[in-house]
């Protein structure tokens, strides 16, 4: 009982003047609060609280459930307490079976005793199973039994409070311990797509998945460099005891160009934080950008193969692609495929395979592509390199020797004279006239060159060589001279 010092308010006095009282079930509880400024009696046990404004608390027939702490309070807010045990052989424990423990914290198994004189007040596993070896507990007859430093492994542990009463072990109702996990790692966050490309007016929707050990993980969508609260919708799942998942879906029903930017899904718990971002790009309309993978001017040798390759970005998806040559559309020899199988891929490849090209197949090859918003094209100028071919070699009526050769690139014609029967002609002869015959014709295909020399300059028997050559190769034609007296008897051209 409190000691009184005169001149300052003192706590009330309780009769009987004890800190604890043991009453047999069915007997009377009579408690008197002595204080001129009496306010109330309060009774507490487990979660139950009762009040009484009479200064004498009387319970005529005490029950086990009347076990608990009785507190008398005066007008100064000072109080005194007595703890009453109502001994009931049929009800040794008062129980609140709700049992939750936070991992690494202590938790109370609420099974206060109605008889403080029993022995071996402790915890036991259900159905005779032993408690975990590392489980430590501290009994308190007035409150229950405290489990020290709860482990996650104790989750769903079934246990009883136990005590020996008159040499016999008595068990309480069973308790199932539910462990609330402590955060020992940052949340795991992921996003449905890392980037989004949309046209104005289209819906933007992105989902962030947050995984953690419990639902108390915090998460939010944030717009980088903005404080605006974004509208989110949620779904959640418990995949077992310590495996929680939340999906936070952010939606902009009609995206605008100025909605473009980086959106962050942020999550944190008491251990730390994690985030993941997604990028939104909103364009006012679709687009196609074509990138040639080879030079758009192509030189290829006669009979060889060439692949015309383009990469292109198309948004929205390409709808029509074609390769065209001389107003004709290729139905085969080409393929078109996405650069990656990624769902957000906008890059594609198109390849036209030209095989064993002939000199006549040079020209402009055009790739055309379109989507619902735009069309785009790119042209390749293909030049087929061909070895010169001597088309004609003649002696003209005016005494000129003429050689006409075709090839690509433009052939050069050189003339040589070989005296007698020598086949190696070394002395070069300057032409009197050289013309490119089709310079104003179509830009592709063979170029025709005509070259002439004056045969009157030759005074001896021999051979004249007309040699046409370019980067690809060379071809020659020959004129044989035979003199009879002062006359050129005959000129035999041969290749």
């Amino acid at each position: 009982q409190p000691s009184v010092s005169p001149g300052e308010p003192s706590p009330p006095s309780i009769h009987p003047a004890k800190s604890e009282l043991i009453v047999r079930v069915g007997n009377e509880i009579r408690l008197l609060c002595i204080d001129p400024g009496f306010v109330k009696w309060t009774f507490e046990i487990l979660d139950e609280t009762n009040e009484n404004k009479q200064n004498e608390w009387i319970t005529e027939k005490a029950e086990a459930t009347n076990t608990g702490k009785y507190t008398c309070t005066n007008k100064h807010g000072l109080s005194s307490s007595i703890y009453v045990f109502v001994r009931d052989p049929a009800k040794l424990f008062l129980v609140d079976r709700s049992l939750y423990g936070k991992e690494d914290n202590d938790t109370l198994v609420r099974c206060p005793l109605t008889d403080p004189e029993v022995t071996s007040y402790s915890l036991k596993g259900c159905q005779g199973k032993p408690l975990p070896k590392d489980l430590r507990f501290v009994p308190d007859p007035k409150a229950g039994i405290t489990i020290k430093s709860v482990k996650r492994a104790y989750h769903r542990l079934c246990l009883h409070c136990s005590a020996d009463q008159e040499g016999k072990s008595v068990l309480s109702d069973k308790f199932i311990l539910k462990v609330r996990p402590a955060f020992k790692a940052v949340p795991v966050v992921s996003v449905s797509k890392a980037s989004y490309l949309l046209r104005e007016g289209e819906e933007f929707t992105v989902t962030c998945t947050i995984k953690d050990v419990s639902s108390s993980v915090y998460s939010t969508w944030k717009r980088e460099n903005s404080q605006t609260k974004l509208q989110e919708k949620y779904n959640s799942w418990h995949h077992g005891d310590f495996n929680y998942e939340r999906q936070a879906t952010l939606t902009i029903s009609s995206a605008r160009v100025n909605d473009s930017g980086v959106f962050m899904c942020y999550a944190n718990n008491t251990f730390g934080s994690a985030n993941v971002t997604t990028t939104l790009e909103v364009v006012d309309k679709g687009f196609i950008n074509i990138f040639p993978m080879i030079n758009t001017t192509v030189f290829v040798n006669d009979g060889e193969n060439v692949d015309l390759i383009v990469e292109y970005e198309a948004f929205p998806k390409p709808e029509h692609q074609q390769w065209i040559y001389m107003n004709r559309t290729f139905t085969d020899k080409w393929e078109d495929y996405p650069k990656s199988e990624n769902e957000s891929n906008i890059r594609y490849v198109s390849e036209l395979h030209l095989t064993r090209l002939k000199g006549t197949e040079g020209g402009t090859y055009t790739f055309l592509v379109s989507n619902s918003d735009v069309n785009a094209s790119i042209a390749f100028n293909v030049y087929v390199n061909t070895k010169p071919e001597i088309l004609t070699y003649d002696r003209l009526v005016n005494g000129m020797l003429q050689c006409v050769a075709a090839g690509f690139p433009e052939p050069t014609i050189d003339w040589y004279f070989c005296p007698g029967t020598e086949q190696r002609c070394s002395a070069s002869v300057l032409p009197v006239d050289v013309q490119t015959l089709n310079a104003s014709g179509p830009p592709f295909g063979k170029l025709v060159v005509q070259s002439s020399i004056d045969s009157s300059a030759f005074k001896h028997n021999g051979t004249v060589e007309c040699k046409a050559y370019n980067d690809v190769g060379k071809t020659s034609a020959y004129f044989n001279f035979a003199f009879k007296g002062n006359n050129k008897e005959q000129i035999h051209p041969h290749t």
Epitope: K178, Y218, S236, H238
Partner: antibody
Amino acid sequence: EVQLLESGGGLVQPGGSLRLSCAASGFTLTSYAMSWVRQAPGKGLEWVSTISGSGGYTYYADSVKGRFTISRDNSKNTLYLQMNSLRAEDTAVYYCARDSGYDRGLDYWGQGTLVTVSS
Amino acid sequence: DIQMTQSPSSLSASVGDRVTITCRASQNIYTYLNWYQQKPGKAPKLLIYDASSLHSGVPSRFSGSGSGTDFTLTISSLQPEDFATYYCQQSSSTPYTFGGGTKVEIK
């Protein structure tokens, strides 16, 4: 003592709106998730919506998504359900209920308020 | 969405009978299952949470069991005040869903 008191029910035409309130006493709203559950005449219980203790997370049944909005005013210790674009099939008694936490079920319920959608 | 199927939809029993109601989930809900009792014109009351934990103040004749997809509510000895409709509800994932209910009537 924990008490939940719903109000705001009544007769409304299809396409109309209604705002239900649930005044909570005996506990602090911010400490608990809160839910709305409805029961059509003669039918079973249907979960409608839940708002987390922090108010940060809201969950909805597919049947009301985009039409109903759950919210709370912690200063008034009051839960709300804003119901727009109401349909005849939304006719029901609407209960607000407290989630006891840690997925222990809805431990306290209000007495319910009747919403009738009819032309 | 997870579907909850209760059976039977109704049953007749006498005071003192042992009554069993089952609830089946369309997918694994672990032990995230609650049982409620509702009397006509009244709000539902929580009986069992987390599949087997008795809510505070609920008589011990009520018990719950099960995990995963199959759950049972048992009333060991039916009392006059137990005649009501019983609902199961999963709180494993949103949208949370209720079973169709089981009406327990007097035989």
